[in-house]
């Protein structure tokens, strides 16, 4: 009867509905390709229910399979900007713990100014996800153009 | 025991599995940038389980966090078409009630003929989502090229 | 009390959480536009929980509405490669049983080297999904660049 009892007694978070949607805070200092994220109702439509932010990077609190999604739009961009500054690449990966470091999702901008994708991937409690933007172009901080999120799907 | 009892007694919709996938019906008349959608099994693979259509726009019936996704492909399009008619932009937002009006998701076509993205966002009962396509180009009505949908994820 | 009892007694798979994320194995022989997929923990971060592979194609085991997602990146690609070899198109569809054959999702590369999209669609037990890549360009087999997956969402 464990599963039904868990549902009756435990709060929503313990049903495994961990979810987060983040907006861009800022880019990293020179030599740091990471994007730094922020989330919370005071900021608009971003939120964290379960996962946490650790110095702008997303840390997972529950083991499971997650849907990870991202959209990044380059600021002040046209197709000629994008091609002139090629390669500009966005990679989402597990950056810590180091033993689990791996690239999960990678896209190049080529002649476009926006990349958007999503994938299912197993994540473990304590995994920190980093989003690395290589190249010299700046991402837009508009909340409808650049965002990053995860959704717990199943154990 | 409230949660378990609710599960036993209430129909599927009340478990919070609201979901919709829509196909393009038509574009708006002059000066109306909105796309008008339709859904239902008679039309093919589109459906509405929970949300409703209000004059071709999607109205939410349950509060919660939703995954919103969209793909729009321009008809008779090549990379030169897209760049010649730039800027052609697609924006998904809450258009009513006016007090909650906000852009949720925005993409430009630049030199591409298809945009596709998805994001998590809180939506409330009564929110109506509009999809605005700026510019003069027509979207494809092929059901595998242009579609729009939402999926309830959690309260 | 059937629903609560089912939850207590049945394994996770019977709760309807079918999910799969696949990585590219190889392309088809000449005249076969299909991509052939593989999945399993020994291969990295790909997995099948419920659906199965049948000669590299994904077969559904549970009726329901699914979120289908895909990303395909062309190998050794630049925007000029992509435009020179246009049209290169990726289509995801039900390829068997023949009576249910239909294209679900279609994207062209135009001047880009990656396509990524997702959609909700009803699928039935026994449906086999095929991913057809037309043209002469090869997809990347990097697991962070090319992947294909499904997630059961609701009955």
């Amino acid at each position: 009867q464990r599963f039904a009892q868990a549902q009756q007694q435990l709060p929503l978070e313990s049903l495994g509905w961990d979810v987060a949607e983040l907006q861009l805070n800022h880019t990293g200092p020179q030599q740091d390709p990471r994007l730094y994220w922020q989330g919370g109702p005071a900021l608009g439509r971003s939120f964290l229910h379960g996962p946490e932010l650790d110095k702008g990077q997303l840390r997972i609190h529950r083991d499971g399979i997650y849907m990870v999604h991202i959209q990044v739009t380059l600021a002040i961009c046209s197709s000629t900007t994008a091609s002139r500054h090629h390669p500009t690449t966005l990679a989402v990966g597990i950056c810590s713990p180091a033993s689990r470091s791996i690239s999960l999702l990678r896209l190049s901008f080529h002649q476009g100014c926006t990349i958007a994708s999503q994938r299912l991937t197993p994540l473990a409690r304590g995994d920190t996800l980093c989003t690395n933007l290589t190249g010299t172009l700046l991402p837009s901080r508009n909340t409808d153009e650049t965002f990053f999120g995860v959704q717990w799907v199943r154990p | 025991q409230r949660f378990a009892q609710a599960q036993q007694q209430l129909p599927l919709e009340s478990l919070g599995w609201d979901v919709a996938e829509l196909q393009l019906n038509h574009t708006g008349p002059q000066q109306d940038p909105r796309l008008y959608w339709q859904g239902g099994p008679a039309l093919g693979r589109s459906f509405l389980h929970g949300p409703e259509l209000d004059k071709g726009q999607l109205r939410i019936h349950r509060d919660g966090i939703y995954m919103v996704h969209i793909q729009v492909t321009l008809a008779i399009c090549s990379s030169t078409t897209a760049s010649r008619h730039h800027p052609t932009t697609l924006a998904v937002g809450i258009c009513s009630p006016a007090s909650r009006s906000i852009s949720l998701l925005r993409l430009s076509f630049h030199q591409g003929c298809t945009i596709a993205s998805q994001r998590l966002t809180p939506l409330a009962r009564g929110d109506t989502l509009c999809t605005n396509l700026t510019g003069t180009l027509l979207p494809s009505r092929n059901t595998d090229e242009t579609f729009f949908g939402v999926q309830w994820v959690r309260p | 009390q059937r629903f609560a009892q089912a939850q207590q007694q049945l394994p996770l798979e019977s709760l309807g959480w079918d999910v799969a994320e696949l990585q590219l194995n190889h392309t088809g022989p000449q005249q076969d536009p299909r991509l052939y997929w593989q999945g399993g923990p020994a291969l990295g971060r790909s997995f099948l929980h419920g659906p199965e592979l049948d000669k590299g194609q994904l077969r559904i085991h549970r009726d329901g509405i699914y979120m289908v997602h895909i990303q395909v990146t062309l190998a050794i690609c630049s925007s000029t490669t992509a435009s020179r070899h246009h049209p290169t198109t990726l289509a995801v569809g039900i390829c068997s049983p023949a009576s249910r054959s239909i294209s679900l999702l279609r994207l062209s590369f135009h001047q880009g080297c990656t396509i990524a999209s997702q959609r909700l669609t009803p699928l039935a037990r026994g449906d086999t999904l095929c991913t057809n890549l037309t043209g002469t360009l090869l997809p990347s087999r990097n697991t962070d660049e090319t992947f294909f997956g499904v997630q059961w969402v609701r009955p």
Epitope: - | T27, G28, P29, Q30, Q38, A42, L138, R141 | -
Partner: nanobody, 118 residues
Amino acid sequence: QLQLVESGGGLVQLGGSLTLSCTASGIIFNSDYVGWYRQAPGSDRELVALTSNMRTNYADSVEGRFTISRDNAKNTVYLQMNSLKPEDTAVYYCNVNRMTSYGPRDYWGQGTQVTVSS
């Protein structure tokens, strides 16, 4: 049942102009997708111009030379073709794609031949 009849085709010199007409037996709605397709011998049918609700798209091969327009009062759609080239030689078909409660429905004309001589 919408019937479509094309007219205006013929033989024209390189660089010349023609206007094709497509007259419908009933109302063509603003929200209908109305297109002109063409098919050259040994080739697939190609969509060259499309209009609906004041939006218009053209194939690269005809952009700037062809113009699609409609006269709602006459239930007629036109294709003005300028600076014609030999590669424009084809049978031109009018198409109305109408969304119904059972999905899209296509209506076709019988076609009109356009031949461009050099």
